[in-house]
């Protein structure tokens, strides 16, 4: 107690007792003092620190008629639902002016069945994959020994003999339950039962089998699934986000994926209705009665180019004397790739067909030799990509140009003389 000028006698005439019990117990500590005059406020200390939020009540009883007479002051501290944090040394404290007095200590202890600080948690694991479970318990009284159980069967001969806080499981092939028992001198407490659900392993070796402009055939190797056969596999494809890309470990695609289910076996699937000449990312997961495996990493794939699906549009062919003007527009149908150019074919009645590569221009002027009196001259045009030619247009007859008729404005092109652009009967 703080130094004073008088060896003052402590005003305390009753000190806190001791409480020892199991968790959840409710108890009361009590101290009593006798003072002359105005009674002071009684405070409670735990391990030497004032309890700011103590659940305490103070009762004051005068022992005489005069306020200068003695008072009996009783302070009671209620401990509800005893916890480990409540344990320690308890004292009462009063301030009499600048002097401080503390009572003799009482002790609160905890003793009962073990109490779990950590219990095994439900989780999912891939078949035949190692994992750990945790369990931690404390008294008092100590020591606390643990015994692990798998599907209600003890994993050691006696508590404390097997694994303690952490149980290493090398792998499971079926969904199992785990719990742990905590043993101390007071008895046994059993933890919650954790269900460990065995899911299929992640599929491996996802790869491309064949490619077509609008479909991809993919295959994979299934992972182990324990005693549970696979029911199906799910494949997801998503358009690659230009510039963004799906990184190998990225959890979600940038947009809603195209999802397909495959019956298994075989572990193969044809993905149709895709865009030609387009990068995709694909991944696969397989499911058993216990649930789905984790997804594979995203695999980048690409559909090949295809040929244009339609001919060029709005072809017009007119002729004015020894010149023929032909022009057209890009096909409306999908190109299925990068347009590389156009091919033009023309033919007269009873004459062989002549083919020309026009490049990416959409018009051409042909310089005809002779008087151009050949009859029934027709022109066809086709677009092409790196994958080949698209369909040819229907033959368009070369019409004579009439004054007032619009004529395309373009650079006059004289076709090269080799091969000579001439009709043998002219």
């Amino acid at each position: 107690a703080p130094r004073g000028t008088q060896a003052e006698e402590s005003p305390f005439v009753g000190n806190p007792g001791n409480i020892t019990g199991a968790r959840g117990l409710t108890g009361t500590l009590r101290c009593q003092l006798q003072v002359q005059g105005e009674p002071p406020e009684v405070h409670w200390l735990r391990d030497g620190q004032i309890l700011e939020l103590a659940d305490s009540t103070q009762t004051q009883v005068p022992l005489g008629e005069d306020e200068q007479d003695d008072w009996i002051v009783v302070s009671q501290l209620r401990i509800t639902s005893l916890q480990l944090s409540d344990t320690g040394q308890y004292q009462c404290l009063v301030f009499l002016g600048h002097q401080t007095f503390v009572s003799q200590p009482g002790y609160v202890g905890l003793e009962g069945l073990p109490y779990f600080l950590e219990e095994p948690e439900d989780r999912t694991v891939a078949a035949n994959t190692p994992f750990n479970l945790s369990c931690q318990a404390q008294g008092p009284p100590e020591p606390v020994d643990l015994l692990w159980l798998q599907d209600a069967v003890p994993l050691a001969t006696a508590p404390g003999h097997g694994p303690q806080r952490s149980l290493h499981v090398p792998g499971l092939n079926k969904t199992s339950s785990f719990s742990c028992e905590a043993h101390n001198a007071k008895g046994v407490t059993t933890s919650r039962t954790a269900t460990i659900t065995v899911l299929p392993q992640q599929p491996r070796n996802l790869h491309l089998v064949s490619r077509q402009p609008t479909e991809l055939e993919v295959a994979w190797t299934p992972g182990l699934s324990g005693i549970y056969p696979l029911t199906h596999c799910t494949l997801q494809a998503v358009l690659s986000d230009d510039g963004m890309g799906i990184q190998a470990g990225e959890p979600d695609p940038p947009e809603e994926p195209l999802t397909s289910q495959a019956s298994v076996p075989p572990h193969q699937l044809r993905l149709g209705s895709l865009h030609p000449h387009t990068p995709y990312h694909i991944r696969v997961a397989c499911t058993s009665s216990q649930g789905p495996s984790s997804w594979t990493h995203w695999l980048p794939v690409e559909t090949p180019e295809g040929v244009p699906l339609g001919p060029p549009e709005n072809i017009s062919a007119t002729r004015n004397g020894s010149q023929a003007f032909v022009h057209w527009q890009e096909p409306r149908a999908p190109l299925q790739g990068t347009l590389l150019g156009y091919r033009l074919a023309y033919q007269g009645q009873d004459t062989p067909e002549v083919l020309m590569d026009i490049g990416l221009r959409q018009e051409v002027t042909l310089e005809l030799q002779g008087d151009g009196s050949v009859s029934n001259l027709t022109v066809c045009v086709a677009a092409y990509t790196a994958a080949g030619d698209g369909p040819w247009s229907l033959p368009v007859p070369l019409e004579a140009w009439r004054p007032g008729q619009a004529q395309p404005v373009h650079q006059l092109v004289k076709e090269p003389s080799t091969p000579a652009f001439s009709w043998p009967w002219w």
Partner: antibody, heavy 121, light 111 residues
Framework: QVQLQQPGAELVKPGASVKLSCKAS????????MNWVKQRPGQGLEWIGE????????NHNEKFKSKATLTVDKSSSTAYMQFSSLTSEDSAVYYC??????????????WGQGTSVTVSS | DIVLTQSPASLAVSLGQRATISCRAS??????????MNWFQQKAGQPPKLLIY???NQGSGVPARFRGSGSGTDFSLNIHPVEEDDTAMYFC?????????FGGGTTLEIK
């Protein structure tokens, strides 16, 4: 409001005694301890002692134990300090100060204006 | 007795700036989880006025410009921003043990 009234000055001869008074108002006199503090000109503060007006209980600074006697008159809500065997060292301003309780302990929250004691022949 | 040493003995601070006064105790003034340290202001010809109790709690009617901090043996009083009216003597005081003791005081002058 809380007030502690003290006489302004006392002139006393060496070897004599002086009884300083402090009249309290504005609160229940018996509910708070009363302190006495000494301050010499241009110097620090020294705590002399305190008294519980409800029962007369006192706590003293050992240095002043034989010099200062603390008493109260509850009927007039007045605290007294008798200072004996005065010497020039006892020339100082003497304050009474009430102990107001913070949540857990006393702090001197209200002070009188002080009495200037001059010891001179 | 517990000895309290204040520093500096005096300081001059410009209006609106921060003033910091330190107080060191010869032994810890903490007990029961409380720091038994108070701060007082004394203007010329007046009694001391309680500014801070229990190291950091403001006394009744004390402006928020006055802040106390610290624990154990080292404590400080901060005044920010200082005002003309803050010219005074400042004392720390411990009330952990009998007798309560005071620091030697710090004179604050406003420039």
């Amino acid at each position: 409001q809380v007030q502690l009234q003290q006489p302004g000055a006392e002139l006393v001869k060496p070897g004599a005694s002086v009884k300083l008074s402090c009249k309290a108002s504005g609160y229940t006199f018996t509910s708070k301890w009363m302190n006495w503090v000494k301050q010499r000109p241009g110097q620090g503060l020294e705590w002399i002692g305190e008294i519980n007006p409800s029962n007369g209980r006192t706590n003293h600074n050992e240095k002043f134990k034989s010099k200062a006697t603390l008493t109260v008159d509850k009927s007039s809500s007045t605290a007294y300090m008798q200072f004996s065997s005065l010497t020039s060292e006892d020339s100082a301003v003497y304050y009474c100060a009430r102990s107001g309780y913070g949540k857990y302990y006393s702090a001197m929250d209200y002070w009188g204006q002080g009495t200037s004691v001059t010891v001179s022949s | 007795d517990i000895v309290l040493t204040q520093s500096p003995a005096s300081l001059a601070v410009s209006l609106g700036q921060r003033a910091t006064i330190s107080c060191r105790a010869s032994e810890s003034v903490d007990n029961y989880g409380i720091s038994f340290m108070n701060w007082f202001q004394q203007k010329a010809g007046q009694p001391p006025k309680l500014l801070i109790y229990a190291a950091s709690n403001q006394g009744s009617g004390v402006p928020a410009r006055f802040r106390g901090s610290g624990s154990g043996t080292d404590f400080s009083l901060n005044i920010h921003p200082v005002e003309e009216d803050d010219t005074a003597m400042y004392f720390c005081q411990q009330s952990k043990e009998v007798p309560p003791t005071f620091g030697g005081g710090t004179t604050l002058e406003i420039k």
